[in-house]
């Protein structure tokens, strides 16, 4: 005859305050006759949770049908949870006994214990923005959690990052844990687009881990590029010249021109475009009088971004004898 | 100590009705099936009728003979269990005796006394 | 329904010998591993009681000197050694299907 063995399979069950928790338990055999009842804690002084035979238990039900034939599934649910619920239970065979019952057999116990979900991750990125190929660091927390082990795992653009640093306070015994981390992160120049994310896996997340995000476009400064250029082509007395901004980002940008030195207040075409990777390009084009021009004109091209310090690029203008002859012989 | 207690026997005509009781102390009466079991010389022992719990939604089974003229009935708030005997028979007359079921499968480990039942003109 | 036969209908045995009951079912009273057969004892005047449950396991407060044994159609009741107290009338009943059926009984007299 096969001895009769008392299954608990879940060592720890994290309940949620006001929830139903459920405690598995069950038997190999039918024999000896006689009730299982439900106890937390061990000793004189434990607590009886349920018995199937004797009294009433309104928070207690049972998952399957005891009257069943051949039952062996000894589970209960209990509902309502509340903090002072939690414990180590046992489920316990009893030999049917005269005039009392005698215990026959326990289960190893499942500790019962209130989990916590932890708050969704929070992730903040540097205070000012930074250029491409150098590090900033982003910080996540998470709060409220409970027990103490969790996960935290960062994500660039899906990649997973390696060069982070993780803390869960407090150290000792607490009702809730916090977590704090701070990832480094290394900037390309494409990072506008890019993101990073916070992953937080804990056991009251039922495998379904919390994420926070943050926004490289918020961390990262691309700086432009400058280009000034003369168009070959004239307009009656007037010669093209072209600024291109290319390759910025954020899109704030300030560009003025300069006439061998004194800038000019006069309005100028532009256009604005973005690019596929979130960076912006500017042209600019400023038409110079070349009627009664000299041949040392310098045009100046100077660009302001995002509060920085003020980047230029020059031109010499290239007026030919023809080009003035051309222009004098122009009516007004 | 479990304690089960019939009464309401006694003669009756053919075509009768009858009511008897049983009492139970000593035990959650809720959590127990409860039976009725007669014995006469002429059959022996025959199980007559069980009633089970309010999860069961107190389901009930008979006996063929006995089916459509008995009635088996329970009150958890009184720890009784009664059994309704209508259009009494000559062959209904015998020892009844109320019955708990320990283990949901037939298992008679307590008996009352039992009370008798007789049908005769 | 389950027909129970017990046999012999009445025995002598003497005092300190082995008394064997037997009680054969019309069907199989046997599932999943387990025998629906028990086994009473009841003296002029009083109830039926439980001696034996699920074929082969003893009720508690039962003396050890009554077992019971057997599977599927065939159960037998033994009692060594037999005491004068055990003078009495015993009946199976089987617990396999509804209605649950007893045996005819079997009168022990103590030589």
């Known amino acids: 005859e096969e001895e009769l063995q008392m299954i608990q399979p879940e060592k720890l069950l994290l309940v949620t305050v006001g929830k139903t928790a459920t405690l598995h338990c069950t038997v190999t055999s039918l024999l000896p006759v006689g009730p299982v009842l439900w106890f937390r804690g061990v000793g004189p002084g434990r607590e009886l949770i349920y018995n199937q035979k004797e009294g009433h238990f309104p928070r207690v039900t049972t998952v399957s049908d005891l009257t069943k034939r051949n039952n062996m599934d000894f589970s209960i649910r209990i509902s309502s949870i509340t903090p002072a619920d939690v414990g180590t239970y046992y489920c316990v065979k009893f030999r049917k006994g005269s005039p009392e019952n005698v215990e026959f057999k326990s289960g190893p116990g499942t500790e019962m214990a209130l989990g916590a979900k932890p708050s969704a991750p929070v992730v903040l990125g540097p205070a000012a923005r930074t250029t491409p190929e150098h590090t900033v660091s982003f910080t996540c927390e998470s709060h409220g959690f409970s027990p103490r082990d969790i996960t935290l795992k960062w994500f660039k653009n899906g990649n997973e990052l390696s060069d982070f640093q993780t803390n869960v306070d407090p150290t000792g015994q607490s009702v809730a844990y916090s977590i704090r981390s701070t990832a480094r992160v290394v900037l390309d120049p494409w990072d506008v687009r890019s993101q990073v994310i916070c992953e937080v896996a804990h056991v009251t997340l039922q495998g379904d881990p919390l994420r926070g995000t943050a926004n490289l476009s918020e961390a990262i400064r691309v700086p432009p590029t400058l280009e000034v250029t003369q168009q070959p082509m004239r307009v009656g007395n007037q010669v093209n010249v072209t600024c291109q901004v290319r390759k910025f980002y954020p899109q704030s940008l300030q560009l003025t021109w300069s006439e061998n030195g004194n800038v000019c207040q006069r309005e100028t075409a532009s256009t604005l475009t973005e690019n596929k990777d979130g960076t912006y390009n500017w042209t600019s084009w400023f038409l110079v009088n070349i009627s009664d021009q000299r041949d040392d004109v310098v045009l100046t091209c100077q660009v302001k971004h995002d509060g920085q310090l003020a980047v230029s690029k020059r031109l010499a203008l290239e007026v030919t004898v023809h080009q003035k002859d051309q222009s004098s012989d122009a009516t007004p | 100590e479990v304690k089960l207690e019939e009464s309401g026997g006694g003669l009756m005509q053919p075509g009768g009705s009858m009511k008897l009781s049983c009492v139970a102390s000593?035990?959650?009466?809720?959590?127990?099936?409860m039976n009725w079991v007669r014995q006469s010389p002429e059959k022996g022992l025959e199980w007559v009728a069980e009633i089970r719990l309010k999860s069961n939604n107190y389901a009930t089974h008979y006996a063929e003979s006995v089916k459509g003229r008995f009635t088996i009935s329970r009150d958890d708030s009184k720890s009784s269990v009664y059994l309704q005997m209508n259009n009494l028979r000559a062959e209904d007359t015998g020892i009844y005796y109320c019955?708990?079921?320990?283990?949901?499968?037939?298992?008679?480990?307590?008996w009352g006394q039992g009370t008798t039942l007789t049908v005769s003109s | 329904d389950i027909v129970l036969t017990q046999s012999p209908a009445s025995l002598a045995v003497s005092l300190g010998q082995r008394a064997t009951i037997s009680c054969r079912a019309s069907?199989?009273?046997?599932?999943?591993?387990?025998?629906?057969m028990y086994w009473y004892q009841q003296k002029p005047g009083q109830p039926p009681k439980l001696l034996i449950y699920l074929a082969s396991n003893l009720e508690s407060g039962v003396p050890a000197r009554f077992s019971g044994s057997g599977s599927g159609t065939d159960f037998t009741l033994n009692i060594h050694p037999v005491e004068e107290e055990d003078a009495a009338t015993y009946y199976c009943q089987h617990s396999g299907e509804l209605p649950y059926t007893f045996g005819g009984g079997t009168k022990l007299e103590i030589k």
């Open positions: 069907k199989s009273v046997s599932t999943s591993g387990y025998n629906y």
């Open positions: 000593g035990f959650t009466f809720s959590n127990y099936w």
């Open positions: 019955i708990r079921d320990y283990d949901y499968d037939a298992y008679f480990d307590y």
